[in-house]
């Protein structure tokens, strides 16, 4: 019987060009975590395997960093990074738990752009 629950950062936003940490936490179970997959809609970003450690997909190695913990750091964000992200926990003996995060990448704020210019 699967008793665990996944807590995530939920819906988050970040600025274009910046970075964001995606975090999930599995609780309320004594099951052993054997692997965590991080996926974006239909793309596999990275895995953290209990035996091998982290492996980042070659498609994302320049923009994705492992951690902190079992989380994932996305760097150099673009508006195309907007969308659903999933943390998939493979556990024994429970099976698979899935958490969902929605990330919205925003253009830099008007206030920040304005701060770069001096008014004559």
């Amino acid at each position: 019987m699967m008793t665990g629950t996944i807590e995530t950062t939920g819906n988050i936003s970040a600025e274009k060009g910046g970075s964001i940490i995606l975090q999930c936490h599995l609780s309320s179970t004594t099951a052993q975590v054997t692997q965590v997959n991080w996926e974006q809609q239909d793309q596999l970003l990275a895995i953290c395997n209990a035996d091998l450690g982290w492996h980042i997909s070659p498609s994302f190695k320049d923009r994705v960093a492992p951690g902190p913990g079992l989380g994932l750091t996305l760097q150099s964000l673009t508006v195309n990074d907007t969308g659903e992200y999933f943390c998939i926990y493979h556990t024994y003996p429970d099976g698979t738990y899935t958490g969902r995060i929605f990330l919205e990448v925003l253009e830099s704020s008007v206030a920040e752009h304005g701060a770069r210019f001096q008014i004559p």
Epitope: N37, L44, S57, P58, I88
Partner: nanobody
Framework: EVQLVESGGGLVQAGGSLRLSCAAS????????MGWFRQAPGKERELVAS???????DYADSVKGRFTISADNAKNTVYLQMNSLKPEDTAVYYC??????????WGQGTQVTVSS
């Protein structure tokens, strides 16, 4: 569940070439990361090369410029072309794969021996 079957290992002289194949069957849908690891006697298993469903690849420094990983998505097969082989490349080579939402799966391994 995904099954992996490797082939192509053998004995080769230093400077020679071998091509390893890894055929995946079973639950092979969605994006993937597939790779080749190797383990020499008394040493830890190390990543040699990996490839993603998007076709991007990554290599260990020790094999860059000598080994090439490629994938045939229609055949669910990944290849490792090994050129300019050295005695230190001698090891058991293992294929590994993760498909979307799935766990890491290992092949049974194939022996590569490079004689000097």
């Amino acid at each position: 569940e995904v099954q992996l079957v490797e082939s192509g290992g053998g004995l080769v002289q230093a400077g020679g070439s071998l091509r390893l194949s890894c055929a995946a069957s079973g639950r092979t849908f969605g994006d993937y990361i597939m790779g080749w690891f190797r383990q020499a006697p008394g040493k830890e298993r190390e990543l040699v090369a990996s490839v993603s469903g998007g076709g991007n690849s990554d290599y260990a420094d020790s094999v860059k410029g000598r080994f090439t990983i490629s994938a045939d998505n229609a055949k669910n097969t990944v290849y490792l072309q090994m050129n300019s082989l050295k005695p230190e490349d001698t090891a058991v080579y293992y294929c590994a794969a993760v498909f979307s939402r799935g766990p890491l799966t290992w092949g049974q391994g194939t022996q590569v021996t490079v004689s000097s």
